[in-house]
Amino acid sequence: FSPLRRISIKILVHSLFSMLIMCTILTNCIFMTMNNPPDWTKNVEYTFTGIYTFESLVKILARGFCVGEFTFLRDPWNWLDFVVIVFAYLTEFVNLGNVSALRTFRVLRALKTISVIPGLKTIVGALIQSVKKLSDVMILTVFCLSVFALIGLQLFMGNLKHKCFRNSLENNETLESIMNTLESEEDFRKYFYYLEGSKDALLCGFSTDSGQCPEGYTCVKIGRNPDYGYTSFDTFSWAFLALFRLMTQDYWENLYQQTLRAAGKTYMIFFVVVIFLGSFYLINLILAVVAMAYEEQNQ
């Protein structure tokens, strides 16, 4: 080993070197949180870049750059360091049009903390391992969601467009003439029944066990879907999103109430099955895989 390499190895394995890098990263993070940084922080920025460059040079001199098994670029954690430095010099010395977009990559410096703190390294390692192991569970989840989305599509397509429509019109008005002129929120509130405080017209259905309209209103299928058109089973993609909502239990009771009001109470069976399979079983299966991966990483 050349003297330069020996010195590099000594620096690299020294605990003070790790401490210096950790303190630099944390200080850098503090500086990044500043709203309107003063001019002198520019020099501090250069110092940080210098320290990161020094760290990488030490690692490259001690381990080699890329030829050989344990060299600098063979460790994925060093890829992050390399990217941080490359972007630091790019934003500083190369005149690129939209620099603010590149400055976003400064945030990657905070991720350097992971490679320095051993505990964090383990957790992130477990996370990456779990993602690899999750592929099978993800395939199963997507498959199950797709099957239920297709069932939802067949059962509830267009149902969430059912609304309670006013039973009194002008002489020249018909359902179709109104459908063609409905645009503003004001128009909707003129012709449809709204519960107090509700942003969507009252849903209804045509089956005996679905929601009925109050006196003076009739159920029709007109206009857009609830929640600005985002809640529906009208296409496979919207149905898939609705099923994902059920699986993650993201305000799912609202979707459940809307659908049951428009389609009928019988369809609660569909929701029971989806919640049990999707929300209770699949979510816990995902958690189990993550837990197993973390356990393996710890061992």
């Epitope: 397509m157 267009g158 039973n167 009194s168 018909t174 359902l175 009739t218 029709v220 299928k221 007109i222």
Partner: nanobody
């Protein structure tokens, strides 16, 4: 395609009466907002004569008030227009309009569904 069956048209003398029927008896007709009678005289635009909402409330054109009566038989899914004291200016093709929701088998569809029309001629 959904079809409304209209009947009762014909030739009648001024001052006479006619009863028009409009049957939406097909299972495809689910629920109407209203079912109405419209007429179109030669060279004129189609205009409302009378309509009846599903709850029974009615609307009449000024020319039909006091002479015409619209009624419905929900069991038979039929709407009737009783026309009394007919005048020559009542001569027109009378159309039935189901404004509401139909079932296509796969989904529900709301809109206007017109009949073929029945001709009413008032002349001496």
């Amino acid at each position: 395609e959904v079809q409304l069956v209209e009947s009762g048209g014909g030739v009648v003398q001024p001052g006479g009466s006619l009863r028009l029927s409009c049957a939406a008896s097909s299972r495809q007709f689910i629920r109407d907002v209203f079912t109405g009678w419209y007429r179109q005289a030669p060279g004129k635009q189609r205009e409302l004569v009378a309509r009846i909402y599903n709850e029974g409330n009615t609307n009449y054109a000024d020319s039909a008030k006091g002479r015409f009566t619209i009624s419905r038989d929900n069991a038979k899914k039929t709407v009737y227009l009783q026309m009394n004291s007919l005048r020559p200016e009542d001569t027109a093709l009378y159309y039935c309009l189901f404004s509401g929701t139909i079932s296509t088998g796969r989904e529900y569809r709301s809109g206007d569904y017109w009949g073929q029309g029945t001709l009413v001629t008032v002349s001496s």
